[in-house]
């Protein structure tokens, strides 16, 4: 049997946010139901995690031996602290789209570990804000965006923006 440390060396995690409790659930991406040491985990989910606080989970299973895999859960900031904002200037709304993630509230997570991603059509931008220029007037554009904390996606949003009519004579 392999050690649990070896078996689950590359385990990945998804973070799910509960807007009512303002707590996260970490979903462990494994095929079998694992044990989580002192932490309670139901169906491979660790519940009631506070934003920006680390939690340590010892992952074990009868298919592997000691030592257990010690997984540090780096809990992201609360989702409601981020808003996707349309920053397009009215006078340029016929050929321009501007989108920006705004942090409307402070948090204690290290901002160095936050990355932002936009995808508009086949264009990908790793920025907190984007400005698309020279677009067609009166066209619909869809932009998907996500925020990652330590490379784990914890929130995403999509915007469908229709550019304005062009000015007469253009």
């Amino acid at each position: 049997k392999p050690t649990c440390d070896e078996k689950y060396a590359n385990i990945t995690v998804d973070y799910l946010y509960n807007k009512e409790t303002k707590l996260f659930t970490a979903k462990l991406n494994v095929n079998e139901n694992v044990g989580c040491g002192n932490n309670t985990c139901t169906n491979n989910e660790v519940h009631n995690l506070t934003e920006c606080k680390n939690a340590s989970v010892s992952i074990s299973h009868n298919s592997c031996t000691a030592p257990d895999k010690t997984l540090i859960l780096d809990v992201p900031p609360g989702v409601e602290k981020f808003q996707l904002h349309d920053c397009t200037q009215v006078e340029k709304a016929d050929t321009t789209i501007c989108l920006k993630w705004k942090n409307i509230e402070t948090f204690t997570c290290d901002t160095q570990n936050i990355t932002y991603r936009f995808q508009c059509g086949n264009m990908i931008f790793d920025n907190k804000e984007i400005k698309l220029e020279n677009l067609e007037p009166e066209h619909e554009y869809k932009c998907d965006s996500e925020i990652l904390y330590n490379n784990h996606k914890f929130t995403n949003a999509s915007k469908i923006i229709k550019t304005d009519f062009g000015s007469p004579g253009e």
Epitope: K102, I104, N127, K128
Partner: antibody, heavy 119, light 113 residues
Framework: EVQLVESGGDLVKPGGSLKLSCAAS????????MSWVRQTPEKRLEWVAY????????YYPDTVKGRFTISRDNAKNTLYLQMSSLKSEDTAMYYC????????????WGAGTTVTVSS | DVLMTQTPLSLPVSLGDQASISCRSS???????????LEWYLQKPGQSPKLLIY???NRFSGVPDRFSGSGSGTDFTLKISRVEAEDLGVYYC??????????FGGGTKLEIK
């Protein structure tokens, strides 16, 4: 270590131009909105320019609008302030300061660079 | 523009005393999102300003608990419960609610009596 270092301050004649730079290190510069704040010889603090994290939005008070231009190069982790049509009342210590998004706070300031406008 | 008026201009205190600085805005600085972005900065001689308090009453990390902020609407106060020698300098209030027209108060110099 998180650091902001301003440079480019000088003695310049009224009507002249000057470009200030602010080199950032130790943090994810492209995640931060940035501002220039100046301190007059009378020790008053005045906000003079703001730029959003990706350089999309810029704002200025009426006192410098049309004369000052804030810009940034996220690849070089550098903030700039281009000043033209300088007046004697622009004489001040110029600080760059980071603000994590528009509503947070100025948590890191540089040591400042001195601009003197005099004939 | 939002005018921020600080009083007093100068505040002579004895070490160990309480100090209180007032900041009044010319209009409400409650943002439409419900928050009030009122900050306090301290500038010691020969240094750049340092953040003390944000959002009226929240102490920035590393700021001693003898510093406290309070107020609402247009009237705000910074209190230092027991002044120490390292607290001397110029205190500035700042409003960040009316974006992007940021404004600082005129400053209050805290000095030894």
């Amino acid at each position: 270590e998180v650091q902001l270092v301003e440079s480019g301050g000088d003695l310049v004649k009224p009507g002249g131009s000057l470009k200030l730079s602010c080199a950032a290190s130790g943090f994810a510069f492209s995640n931060y909105d940035m501002s220039w704040v100046r301190q007059t010889p009378e020790k008053r603090l005045e906000w003079v320019a703001y730029i959003s994290s990706g350089g999309v939005s810029t704002y200025y008070p009426d006192t410098v609008k049309g004369r000052f231009t804030i810009s940034r190069d996220n690849a070089k982790n550098t903030l700039y302030l281009q000043m033209s049509s300088l007046k004697s009342e622009d004489t001040a210590m110029y600080y760059c300061a980071r603000r994590y998004d528009v509503w947070w706070y100025f948590d890191v300031w540089g040591a400042g660079t001195t601009v003197t406008v005099s004939s | 523009d939002v005018l921020m008026t600080q009083t007093p201009l100068s505040l002579p205190v004895s070490l160990g005393d309480q100090a209180s600085i007032s900041c009044r805005s010319s209009q409400s600085i409650v943002h439409s999102n419900g928050n009030t972005y009122l900050e306090w900065y301290l500038q010691k001689p020969g240094q750049s300003p340092k953040l003390l308090i944000y959002k009226v009453s929240n102490r920035f990390s590393g700021v001693p608990d003898r510093f406290s902020g309070s107020g609402s609407g247009t009237d705000f106060t910074l209190k230092i419960s027991r002044v120490e020698a390292e607290d001397l300098g110029v205190y500035y209030c700042f409003q960040g609610s009316h974006v992007p027209m940021y404004t600082f108060g005129g400053g209050t110099k805290l000095e030894i009596k």
